[in-house]
């Protein structure tokens, strides 16, 4: 697990505790809350990050219209159960034995039930739509410059392969970033679009997860891009199963 050897820290996740007592005396970093060893050469999974967060002391339109099956994370923070690879377990339960099924980004995709609720598989979120509204600027950003800057950001900061950034739409003041990644497309070692989106979301909120790096300073041709609202929609490979009561 690559971590900065000299001072034993995790560049990609500050919500870790690192010690030089790993195999062979190497620096080993464990995620707060779960204690799972993390690979500091890449992004940490959203599940482990949420668990760490919960354990920490409390502190003609070119725009895409989200599909009827798109999910928004309305439930907020919870202390998730992660599998040994750091992924969300398909079924999540709270301390009062209320359970629900989640997708691969940890967003609820069924009505809540009891301990008898079955979630047969972890359904993959294959399409993420990040909807941003930027603060007023002197003029609109050049679309191609904005597109290039956001693609560079996802490639360099979040290590997401460019092929997974499907599109960047812009209609001032709204920016939409589409991330797409099917199960069959994701190879071993590829950053998950859900993890990249979560790191981006935290960056935008000024809560960077990176160790010691400054916050996100987004500029398009030198002009600061300041986000005032973020909405993220998640589309699953299998549509969610909610009762009609919730949909009305």
């Amino acid at each position: 697990h690559t971590a900065a050897q000299d001072n034993c820290t995790c560049p990609t996740n500050k919500m870790t505790v690192c010690s030089p007592d790993g195999p062979g005396g190497r620096c080993q970093c464990r995620a707060l809350g779960s204690g799972m060893a993390v690979d500091c050469s890449t992004l940490t999974s959203k599940c482990l990050l949420l668990k760490a967060r919960m354990s920490a002391p409390k502190n003609a339109r070119t725009l895409v219209r989200p599909s009827e099956h798109a999910l928004v994370d309305n439930d907020g923070l919870y202390d998730p159960d992660c599998d040994p690879e750091g992924r969300f377990k398909a079924r999540q339960c709270n301390q009062t034995s209320v359970c629900w099924c989640v997708n691969s980004v940890g967003v609820r995709r069924t009505d809540k039930g009891d301990l008898s609720l079955r979630c047969d598989e972890l359904v993959r979120t294959h399409h993420i739509l990040i909807d941003l509204r930027h603060r007023p600027t002197a003029g609109a950003f050049n679309h191609s410059d904005l597109d290039a800057e956001l693609r560079r950001l996802f490639r360099e900061r979040y290590r997401l392969h460019p092929k997974f950034v499907a599109a960047v739409h812009y209609e001032q003041p709204t920016i939409q970033i589409e991330l797409r990644q099917n199960t069959s497309q994701k190879a071993a070692g590829d950053v998950d679009i859900g993890d990249a989106a979560y790191y981006f979301e935290r960056d935008i909120k000024g809560e960077s997860l990176f160790q010691g790096r400054g916050g996100l300073d987004l500029r398009v041709r030198g002009e600061p891009l300041q986000v005032e609202r973020t909405l993220i929609y998640y589309l699953d490979e299998i549509p969610p199963k909610f009762s009609m009561k919730r949909l009305t």
Epitope: V17, S19, D21, G22, P23, G25, G33, D83, P84
Partner: antibody, heavy 117, light 107 residues
Framework: QVQLVQSGAEVKKPGASVKVSCKAS????????INWVRQAPGQGLEWMGN????????NYNQKFKDRVTMTRDTSTSTVYMELSSLRSEDTAVYYC??????????WGQGTLVTVSS | EIVLTQSPATLSLSPGERATLSCRAS??????IHWYQQKPGQAPRLLIE???ESISGIPARFSGSGSGTDFTLTISSLEPEDFAVYYC?????????FGGGTKVEIK
Amino acid sequence: QVQLVQSGAEVKKPGASVKVSCKASGYTFTSYWINWVRQAPGQGLEWMGNIYPSNSYTNYNQKFKDRVTMTRDTSTSTVYMELSSLRSEDTAVYYCASYRSDGFAYWGQGTLVTVSS
Amino acid sequence: EIVLTQSPATLSLSPGERATLSCRASQNIGTSIHWYQQKPGQAPRLLIEFASESISGIPARFSGSGSGTDFTLTISSLEPEDFAVYYCQQSNSWPFTFGGGTKVEIK
């Protein structure tokens, strides 16, 4: 060589607290986690939690979370484990153990804590 | 938490025989398993780490194998001093947990 030396046996009354010390030597104290493991008479091993002396980060087994406190004193290379609201079931040998990588390679000699009225 | 189940609870063998001890994890833990030997009145002693990696000073007759959920500690030829209780422990995630132990006794 690495040594973990624990404080002596204790007899306590139910409801009282006990504080066991573990003094480390022979290695860089701040570089290795110190764990606390207990063993009731005739029973198996039970992990209570750990502390990373470099920054005092602690992690407790949920079972003991409300009753256990682990602290460290870097000036004396000593770690402390305090268990409060003692009950008879807490009668056990308490070990401190340090790990090189993930296995507990180094163990203290154990401290017998007897809880009896 | 990850539950470790050791079997058998007791193993009755004679010196010179081969001992095979099993440890099963409730979920995949890769190779984050470690084996200990404990004799009466003594602290446990680390024998094997990361499922199969030997520890200096531990006799070569002790070996470990397995990954995922099933792990084995093998003592190729039992010596009189090997009769003791053996524990497996996982370090995949907190809380770290131990198996219930296997007692290797003289037949």
